[in-house]
Amino acid sequence: LQDPCSNCPAGTFCDNNRNQICSPCPPNSFSSAGGQRTCDICRQCKGVFRTRKECSSTSNAECDCTPGFHCLGAGCSMCEQDCKQGQELTKKGCKDCCFGTFNDQKRGICRPWTNCSLDGKSVLVNGTKERDVVCGPSPADLSPGASSVTPPAPAREPGHSPQ
């Protein structure tokens, strides 16, 4: 015998109090699949969370973070504070990158500068707290009579992964 509840589409629930007829989800709730016996309460984006997508009868609300914070966890379960470029977030707050490291993002930790010599190259532009070293040609290519080197045009550094 077919379960009468299986006919209830997303956005409704199978109401046991009303002879298992399909009732619309009440306000601030949703059901994303058919055949549900209850609707789920919509997520509320409060505090450092802000609403990215409103709740509907068939899908939950989606949150992201207010400016100055970034998402962590599946579905942006947590907001963590941003730091400035040239800093890293420690468990005691934002702190400047140590010499020899950099961070060109507002999140994450400081990364060691590239060691150009490991790839047989020379340093073209020194690193800073916010930017990696730029490696140039190998030292042999810089000998007298070698063709001049045009520094590479600035390009977008690796950025944030979409959450």
């Epitope: 994450g108 400081c110 060691p112 590239t114 990696d132 070293v133 977008r156 690796p158 950025g159």
Partner: antibody
């Protein structure tokens, strides 16, 4: 969807070199650092190095410095890991893995692995 | 210190809770990531930055980190959880940026 597809298995003799490729698709290749990790038979995971595909900047684990070279070809969204002066204990599965956009987080996408066998 | 210490194996019955530890000097000050590795498969990130799950990872997998020990917890374990689990940390040192623990084999009894 993000995919990292690696080159096929290789058999090499001691002293030779091997070059493994990792072709990325489904995202902006230049925007995310690529890492290489290996696992020898019966051993654990071992980090080897990374490359910034945008600048070509690299960093290598001290153990591999002088033997490993990581490069990239942005025109075909491919990273390469070359290991030279191979020894029998370099027999391992080599993986490329993507960093999720900032240093200090976990590696979110991995290639399927490339088995390199070093045998005389 | 750049050594992360894991127990070689942890055994647990189906439905029970498994806890896998990762020890390191002041590891609580670092961000710890955990990977699941099954034979002939690529590693899968199951927890990142101590306690956050990527999309698609079940809520029964969780992580914590304080002092000298980080812990991966798998509650209501299933046969499909049998795998090796590795902790991993990034450092700002130029010589040892990426360090993995030795791995822990999770054995499901019965």
């Amino acid at each position: 969807q993000v995919q990292l597809v690696q080159s096929g298995a290789e058999v090499k003799k001691p002293g030779a070199s091997v070059k493994v490729s990792c072709k990325a698709s489904g995202y902006n290749f230049s925007g995310y650092y690529m890492h290489w990790v290996r696992q020898a038979p019966g051993q654990g995971l071992e980090w080897m190095g990374w490359i910034n595909p945008n600048s070509g900047g690299t960093n290598y684990a001290q153990k591999f410095q002088g033997r490993v070279t990581i490069t990239r070809d942005t025109s075909i969204s491919t990273a390469y890991m070359e290991l030279s002066r191979l020894r029998s204990d370099d027999t391992a599965v080599y993986y490329c893995a993507r960093e999720p956009g900032y240093y200090g987080s976990g590696l979110d996408y991995w290639g399927q692995g490339t088995l390199v066998t070093v045998s005389s | 210190s750049y050594v992360l210490t894991q127990p070689p194996s942890v055994s647990v019955a189906p439905g029970e809770t498994a806890r896998i530890t990762c020890g390191g000097d002041d590891i609580g000050d670092k961000r710890v990531h955990w990977y699941q590795k099954k034979p002939d498969q690529a590693p899968v990130l199951v927890v990142y930055e101590d306690r956050y799950r990527p999309s698609g990872i079940p809520e029964r997998i969780s992580g914590s980190n304080s002092g000298n020990t980080a812990t991966l917890t798998l509650s209501r374990v299933e046969a499909g959880d049998e795998a090796d689990y590795y902790c991993q940390v990034w450092y700002s040192s130029p010589d040892h940026p990426g360090v993995f623990g030795g791995g822990t084999q999770l054995i499901i009894l019965g």
